[in-house]
Structure formats: structure tokens, C-alpha cells
């Protein structure tokens, strides 16, 4: 039960006080008691419940006509059952007794009022009055947790605007309101109550730039909403009529959780006594609601795809046809960024990551725009953000970044359990160097901080700086599976490739050619690849790098070897000993449900079939997956990327609600 104020009574004159329903009010009967008195009794109106406890240990007893010793160990508390119809209509009489004196009476006139700030603390999508049931001042995780949720209003419901909805202090329409959380102030007071009392709604100064609150005029259009709290206004005096009244507020978050903001926002209503104009206003009562800002959540390859993104560039028509066919098979919407908008930047995966935010009443896809800012710089903000599609970005927008700040270097695992700890939304994966040096690269700290601060997908740092481009999607992917954990981790594997090529050579296919059918590309015989000592050394190094990540992933995702599939792949070390794929990197695939768009490796053709394609199909088809090999050689591969790098996917949000987990 909420804490009320302390009321001191005195026999000299009647005391007048306000008691808010649902609060426990302490009654100080000792400090002004007549000197010779040693005991007391209490009588109260039917609407008042008096509790007397004599402790320690506390022996609680509701009052009758008993007398109690007048000593500091006695605690008297009041609660009120109903709101008053008029000021002071509930009475409490304290009688003091002494051995030699007649009883002395002290009178207390109480006004019972109902004041409660309600939000969806039960996370049902509806605001229900919760007076005296739950403590709204705490926010707890888990299925039995409580606490309201706010969305960052980061979409753009007004198509004529270039800004996010939370960047203005207007409510556009009912669509805009739906992105906000409802909070209701319910009051029931005597008619004249607010001639001597005031209600003020307020937020801590440290949080005022993270939230905006609009007051709605009931029964009127949403355009009647006016801002009452926000970056410029930490408090607002409310004009409340006496009697029974409800006031609606709509609350939007302005910032995602981050290193300097844990994501909690407390809104407080304070009841002030303004009856004495000579004195400052006195706080009679406070009620608070704590909101947590919904985190940005990534979706893994195991989530059903809803929309595919790719770029149109010079001569990639065949690539786009293949992606279109795949999207149609997977029943996905397809969005193509035209040449004039992408400015010859085809790396859709690197520019953005599409996740979502969720409150009980609303789920919103949100694009996380990377700070790489190349030709696709404007695409997320101009073409992806829109009505019910939010936007967020982090990191420096001009310089100071590395290739590891592109979002080919940002992936998320499917849900996992690691040594008994559940990650029902998976874990974020990004690449890093294995130790800092003058020329090592790492994801910008602002990006790392943001990802960690979301709390619900605890990040795992992998080692990717050994690659020339340096992205985790160059050596790993996840595909859905019908058994075990519901997925398999795919890892690029030079060992597996050498084994395959050795088997083919042993069967007399040493003359078979890699890169057959590719114009202007020197073809390589299996036997030459196998006998090239330098290439072997390079791939031995690469294998060690991937194996380091393999063990890291097994440990951090709780995987067994049987959860991992090795995809045959060779690499070569280029300048500054950084690795690149030797042939199109098959692990860099587009996963659309059971339909996989895999870079066509142009491996040695044996008995009419590419042995690399055949091997990959034999590994993945038993899982119910369909492999489509896409020719990306000249349009993507030779430019240091593949199918995954050149595409992006919006996926269905998890059915699991983030607030039901315990981070």
C-alpha cells in the first residue's frame, strides 16, 4: 500500500487532513498528548479504518472501545474506505486518559480523496485501475513481473515530414497516438477540493529529455492533445475539477536505452496543499508510475521473412531476378532501391539492420541505420522509415568509423539456453579484433554500448578482424532446422573444402576446374589448388581464426558440434594478411524460411554437377531447406561481398514478449 503523510493531532484544536484512498496514513497521537495521560482510545466514522499496533512484536488490532498505553511503541495508522462527499466529512476522535484527570479529546476531520495514476502495469494492453493492489513504483522483469512499457515514437506517421514523430511536440492523428502508452489520472474528491489543493504531474530533470507526455481532452479529437511534459517541461500543474474525473495522458519515449540511460522513466503526480497563501505549497501525497522504454530487438534467420531489400545496380538484373524468384517462393514483399538512389552502393546488409520494438498494445518494426554512410546513406531514413516503421541510428555520422561498423558485422543468434540461462530472443553477435593494436579495427563503442544497453539479447564479441572486410557474415550464418535447437549454425570451413577436393582428386577428378564458365577469370584445377603450398598456409591460418570463433560460439550459445554444419570454403590472404573468399562465399547466404539464396561457387563440375553445390545441398536439404545458387560473381563477389551482403530482410517479430524474460 502506498505511503501517506503523517498526521499530528492535538487536543488544543481540531486537525483537518486529507487522506488518499489506498494509502496508509500514520497518526501521531503521542507528541501532543496531555502530560498526565497514560492511555488513549480511538473512535472513528464508519468510512475510516484505524489500526493500532503495539510492538515490537507488533500486535495488530482494529479499534473497538479498548484503551491502549500511550507510549512511543504504539503505532496508529488510518486508511479510508470511500471518498468524501464533502470536505472533512469523516471524523476520528482520540480520548486521552490519566489517573487523576478527566478524559481529554482530540478531533481529526478527514477528507478522503481518490487520486490514482494508472498505466498498463500488468502488460495486457489495457489500462486498469490498480489502486492498492500493485506497487507501480517498481518495474520487474519476467512472466510474473510488472511495470508499464513505453515505445520510442520513432516512426514517421506524417509522410510530409522528414522527422520522426518524437521529434515534434504535436500529436498528428490517432495513428500517432497508437505509438504512445496511455496513462490515466483518476480523481474523486469533494466539489470544492481543488480550491485549496493542486495536482502537479512531473518527471525527474534527468529524465525530462527522454519522454514527452500529452494531455488528451476526453471525447475530443486527438488533435486536441497538448504537450504537458517533455524536454522543456519537467512539471505541469493540472486543472482538475472536483467530483469524479478521469484525465488521459499519452506518453512517448524519446530515447532508447543506452549507456547513459537505463531505460526507466518515472512519472509522478503530486497532491499539494495550497490552502495557506502565506506559505509554500506542501506535499500531501505522491503517486508514481515507472515505465521501461522498449528495447530495440533484432530478429534471427529463423524468424519468418516478411520483406526483402536489394539494390539495382549496373548489370545486376540477373541477380535481382534470382532474388525476386526467391522472395516470391518465400511469400515476401520485395523492395528494390533504384540506382539513382543507391549511388552505386549495393551493400544493403551493411547499411541497416531491421529489428522491432514492442509494447503490449503495439509492435513496430525499427530500422537501425549504420554510421557507414556511403551511397545508401539516405535509404533507411527516406525509404524505410515511415508510418509504423521506426528509425534509430548511433555512432559518428561523419568519419571515425571502420568497416566493422557496417551491419554485415551485426548478426543475432536464434533463441538459446546456455548453462541453464535462457536467451529467448537469442544473442547479438558482432565482430571485433582479438586484441587492440594500432591498426586493429573494432565496432564503434557507441554502437557496442547501444546494443548492450538493450539488455534482452546480450551481445557476444566474435573475432572478425582477420578478414579484409571484417564482417561476421563472411564466416557464419544460421538456418532453421526441424530438430534439436530449431536451427543450425553454418560455419565456413577450409578443412571441409580441402577434404572434398582431395576426395574428388582421389576419384580421378584432379583436372576438374574451379571457375569454369566465368569469362575473363583464370580457371584453377583441383590438383593445382591442392598442391599450392601458400594457399594451404593461408587457409590453415583462416581455419584457426574460424575455430576460435567456433569454440566461442559453442560456449556463448551453448552449442554442441552436432548443432554446427561446416560449409566448404576457401580463403586467400590479401594485403596486410587479411582474408578474402577465394571463390564466392557460400555461407554469406540469404535465408528466407526454408528457401536459401546461396552464392554460386563455380566449383569444379564433376559428372555434370558442381561438387561444391552438391556437397552443400547434401548438408542442408535433409533439414527441409531448398538451396538456390545465385550467380553474384561479377556484381558482388569480385567487389568483396556476396548475396547476404547485398540484401536485407525484415522478419516477423518473436511471439515471445521481451518483458517476460529475465536478462
Amino acid at each position: 500500500m502506498a505511503q501517506g503523510t503523517l498526521i499530528r493531532v492535538t487536543p488544543e484544536q481540531p486537525t483537518h487532513a486529507v487522506c488518499v484512498l489506498g494509502t496508509l496514513t500514520q497518526l501521531d497521537i503521542c507528541s501532543s498528548a496531555p502530560e498526565d495521560c497514560t492511555s488513549f482510545s480511538i473512535n472513528a466514522s464508519p468510512g475510516v479504518v484505524v489500526d493500532i499496533a503495539h510492538g515490537p512484536p507488533a500486535k495488530k488490532k482494529s479499534t473497538g472501545s479498548s484503551t491502549w498505553p500511550l507510549d512511543p511503541g504504539v503505532e496508529v495508522t488510518l486508511t479510508m474506505k470511500v471518498a468524501s462527499g464533502s470536505t472533512g466529512d469523516q471524523k476520528v476522535q482520540i480520548s486521552y486518559y490519566g489517573p487523576k484527570t478527566p478524559p481529554v479529546k482530540a478531533l481529526l476531520y478527514l477528507t478522503g480523496v481518490e487520486i490514482s495514476l494508472c498505466a498498463d502495469i500488468t502488460r495486457t494492453g489495457k489500462v486498469k485501475p490498480t489502486r492498492a493492489v500493485k506497487d507501480q513504483r517498481t518495474w520487474t522483469w519476467g512472466p510474473c513481473g510488472q511495470g508499464a512499457i513505453l515505445l520510442v515514437n520513432c516512426d514517421r506517421d506524417n509522410l510530409e515530414s522528414s522527422a520522426m514523430d518524437c521529434e515534434d511536440d504535436e500529436v498528428l492523428d490517432s495513428e500517432d497516438l497508437q505509438d504512445m502508452s496511455l496513462m490515466t489520472l483518476s480523481t474523486k474528491t469533494p466539489k470544492d477540493f481543488f480550491t485549496n489543493h493542486t495536482l502537479v504531474l512531473h518527471v525527474a530533470r534527468s529524465e525530462m529529455d527522454k519522454v514527452r507526455v500529452f494531455q488528451a481532452t476526453r471525447g475530443k479529437l486527438s488533435s486536441k492533445c497538448s504537450v504537458v511534459l517533455g524536454p522543456k517541461w519537467p512539471s505541469h500543474y493540472l486543472m482538475v475539477p472536483g467530483g469524479k474525473h478521469n484525465m488521459d495522458f499519452y506518453v512517448e519515449a524519446l530515447a532508447f536505452p543506452d549507456t547513459d540511460f537505463p531505460g526507466l522513466i518515472t512519472l509522478t503526480i503530486s497532491l499539494l496543499d495550497t490552502s495557506n497563501l502565506e506559505l509554500p505549497e506542501a506535499v500531501v501525497f505522491q503517486d508514481s508510475v515507472v515505465f521501461r522504454v522498449a528495447p530495440w530487438i533484432m530478429t534471427p534467420n529463423t524468424q519468418p521473412p516478411q520483406e526483402v531489400y536489394a539494390c539495382s545496380i549496373f548489370e545486376n538484373e540477373d541477380f535481382l531476378k534470382s532474388v525476386t524468384t526467391l522472395a516470391m517462393k518465400a511469400k515476401c514483399k520485395l523492395t528494390i532501391c533504384p540506382e539513382e538512389e543507391n549511388m552505386d552502393d549495393q551493400w544493403m546488409q551493411d547499411e541497416m539492420e531491421i529489428g522491432y520494438i514492442q509494447a503490449p498494445h503495439k509492435t513496430l518494426p525499427v530500422v537501425f541505420d549504420s554510421p557507414r554512410n556511403r551511397g545508401l546513406k539516405e535509404f533507411p531514413i527516406k525509404r524505410v522509415m515511415g508510418p509504423d516503421f521506426g528509425y534509430v541510428t548511433r555512432g559518428p555520422q561523419t568519419g571515425g568509423i571502420s568497416g566493422l561498423d557496417s551491419f554485415g558485422n551485426l548478426e543475432v543468434s536464434p533463441p538459446v539456453t546456455v548453462r541453464g540461462k535462457e536467451y529467448p530472443l537469442g544473442r547479438i553477435l558482432f565482430g571485433d579484433s582479438c586484441y587492440p593494436s594500432n591498426d586493429s579495427r573494432q565496432m564503434h563503442q557507441a554502437l557496442q554500448d547501444f546494443l548492450s544497453a538493450q539488455q534482452v539479447q546480450a551481445p557476444v564479441k566474435l573475432y572478425s578482424d582477420w578478414l579484409s572486410v571484417g564482417h561476421v557474415d563472411e564466416f557464419l550464418s544460421f538456418v532453421p532446422a526441424p530438430d534439436r535447437k530449431g536451427f543450425r549454425l553454418l560455419l565456413a570451413s577450409p578443412r571441409s573444402c580441402y577434404k572434398l577436393f582431395q576426395e574428388q582428386q582421389n576419384e580421378g577428378h584432379g583436372e576438374a576446374l574451379l571457375f569454369e564458365g566465368i569469362k575473363k577469370k583464370k580457371q584453377q584445377k583441383i590438383k593445382n589448388i591442392l598442391s599450392n603450398k601458400t594457399l594451404r598456409e593461408h587457409n590453415s591460418f583462416v581455419e584457426r581464426c574460424i575455430d576460435w570463433n567456433r569454440e566461442l560460439l559453442k560456449r556463448e550459445l551453448g552449442l554442441a558440434e552436432s548443432d554446427i554444419i561446416d560449409i566448404p570454403q576457401l580463403f586467400k590472404l590479401k594485403e596486410f594478411s587479411k582474408a578474402e573468399a577465394f571463390f564466392p562465399n557460400m555461407v554469406n547466404m540469404l535465408v528466407l524460411g526454408k528457401h536459401l539464396g546461396i552464392p554460386k561457387p563455380f566449383g569444379p563440375v564433376i559428372n555434370g554437377r558442381c561438387c561444391l553445390e552438391e556437397k552443400v545441398c547434401s548438408l542442408l536439404e535433409p533439414l527441409g531447406l531448398q538451396c538456390t545458387f545465385i550467380n553474384d560473381f561479377f556484381t558482388y563477389h569480385i567487389r568483396h561481398g556476396e548475396v547476404h551482403c547485398g540484401t536485407n530482410v525484415r522478419r516477423k517479430p518473436f511471439s515471445f514478449k521481451w518483458w517476460n524474460m529475465v536478462p
Epitope: 568497416g403 594500432n438 577469370k521 583464370k522 589448388i529 601458400t534 590479401k574 594485403e575 567487389r639 568483396h640
Partner: antibody
Framework: QVQLVESGGGLVKPGGSLRLSCAAS????????VSWIRQAPGKGLEWVSF????????YYADSVRGRFTISRDNAKNTVYLQMNSLRAEDTAVYYC?????????????????????WGRGTLVTVSS | QSALTQPRSVSGSPGQSVTISCTGT?????????VSWYQQHPGKAPKLIIY???ERPSGVPDRFSGSKSGNTASLTISGLQAEDEADYYC???????????FGGGTKLTVL
């Protein structure tokens, strides 16, 4: 074959900044490794910085790390060298140079370590 | 003080051969086959004449040849001609935190 032209040099006070540009013609820079090399008056060559224009992989000499930033704009076919906190010892002719990354050998590293195309250079003078 | 050591100058008569040495360490010349040589005429930009120790770009006469032994690389110019008079610089990839090193340069005089 790509041709390179440097610009942006000039006189600057110590502590000042300059941005050098290296514009390419005749071929697309995204197929090339690009380095900046400088030569102080009457002195030898000193390697300054490198960028793999396909994916912004960068490296710097110890003498300029933290003060100079190499970047590129493939759409403009240009590589830049942003030079901050300039010192008198940075006075030199700055050359832009490149090596083609289109190599067909099974393994052919090393292209980024040598420069087969050079610009004519641009003079940077740091003096008060 | 350059990272790779070259003689300040060498000379030879037309038709003769000269060799310019370039001495590094086990962390650069000794470790990598990424040694290159550049020719620079006064007031001009350098020109690549040898890369990967001994390979010649197209258009460079076969009078220019490169080799390496241990931590020392060498450039040999046979059949010296007047137009060979120039400064010559060696360069190598290095394990150090500056990944490309140059020699201090050698002035070749054709007598």
C-alpha cells in the same frame, strides 16, 4: 590504366589542417589499392597511408596515426587524405599511388605493398 | 634515419652493371617477398621498376633485375644507359606498426 591527380596542397600554419584529394580517371578506383607517399624536400620517400577502396580497410604510418585520416568516395572516384594537427616535419610533396587488385593467380598478395601508378604530387608546406 | 638501409650513391659507366643493396631485418625484407624498387628522376614522380623481389612490370627493360638473400634485397642494372641516372628507392612490407617501409634512396650516377 588509371591516371591519378592530386590536389589540395598549399601553405598552412602548424596545428592547421588540409585535405588532399586524389582523383582517378581512366578506371574505377574501387578496383584499386591506394596509398599516399610523401617526400620531404631533398629527402627520401616515406609511406603515409593505405586504403583498400573496395571496403575501406585502412592503415597508417606511426608518424601520422591519429592525425591523418584516409577515406574515399567511390562515386566521385576520389581518395582523400585529411591532415590535422600539422607539423613542420609534415612539409613534403604528397604523392597518391595505386595498385590494381584484379589479379588472377591462385594466391597473389602484395599488391597493396607496391605502387605501379603515381600521380605528380602536391606540395604541402607547414610553416608559421 | 630510414628503416631500410641503402648506399647513398653508386656509379658506373655506360654498358657496365651496378648493384644497389637494400638491407632490412627479419621482420621486413627477411620475412616477406614484398620488396619493390622505384626509380625517380629529378622533379618527377617515382616509377615502379621491380615488385615482389624480382618481378618486372610491363614496359620495364629486362636490364633491371631484382633478388633477395636473407635480410638484404638487391637491384641490378646491367648495360647501364645515361637515362638510368636517377634516385632508386627500395621498399618492403614490414611486421612493424608501419607496414610499408622505404630505404633512404641511392643516387645512381652514370659516368
Amino acid at each position: 590504366q588509371v591516371q591519378l591527380v592530386e590536389s589540395g596542397g598549399g601553405l598552412v600554419k602548424p596545428g592547421g589542417s588540409l585535405r588532399l584529394s586524389c582523383a582517378a580517371s581512366g578506371s574505377t578506383l574501387s578496383d584499386y589499392f591506394v596509398s599516399w607517399i610523401r617526400q620531404a624536400p631533398g629527402k627520401g620517400l616515406e609511406w603515409v597511408s593505405f586504403i583498400n577502396t573496395a571496403n575501406t580497410f585502412t592503415y597508417y604510418a606511426d608518424s601520422v596515426r591519429g592525425r591523418f585520416t584516409i577515406s574515399r568516395d567511390n562515386a566521385k572516384n576520389t581518395v582523400y587524405l585529411q591532415m590535422n594537427s600539422l607539423r613542420a616535419e609534415d612539409t613534403a610533396v604528397y604523392y597518391c599511388s595505386s595498385a590494381n587488385d584484379d589479379v588472377d593467380d591462385i594466391v597473389a598478395p602484395g599488391r597493396g605493398y607496391y605502387m605501379d601508378v603515381w600521380g605528380r604530387g602536391t606540395l604541402v608546406t607547414v610553416s608559421s | 634515419q630510414s628503416a631500410l638501409t641503402q648506399p647513398r650513391s653508386v656509379s658506373g659507366s655506360p654498358g657496365q652493371s651496378v648493384t644497389i643493396s637494400c638491407t632490412g631485418t627479419r621482420g621486413d625484407v627477411g620475412r616477406y617477398n614484398h620488396v619493390s624498387w622505384y626509380q625517380q628522376h629529378p622533379g618527377k614522380a617515382p616509377k615502379l621498376i621491380i615488385y615482389n623481389v624480382y618481378e618486372r612490370p610491363s614496359g620495364v627493360p629486362d636490364r633491371f633485375s631484382g633478388s633477395k638473400s636473407g635480410n638484404t634485397a638487391s637491384l641490378t642494372i646491367s648495360g647501364l644507359q645515361a637515362e638510368d641516372e636517377a634516385d632508386y628507392y627500395c621498399s618492403s612490407h614490414s611486421r612493424s606498426s608501419t607496414p610499408v617501409l622505404f630505404g633512404g634512396g641511392t643516387k645512381l650516377t652514370v659516368l
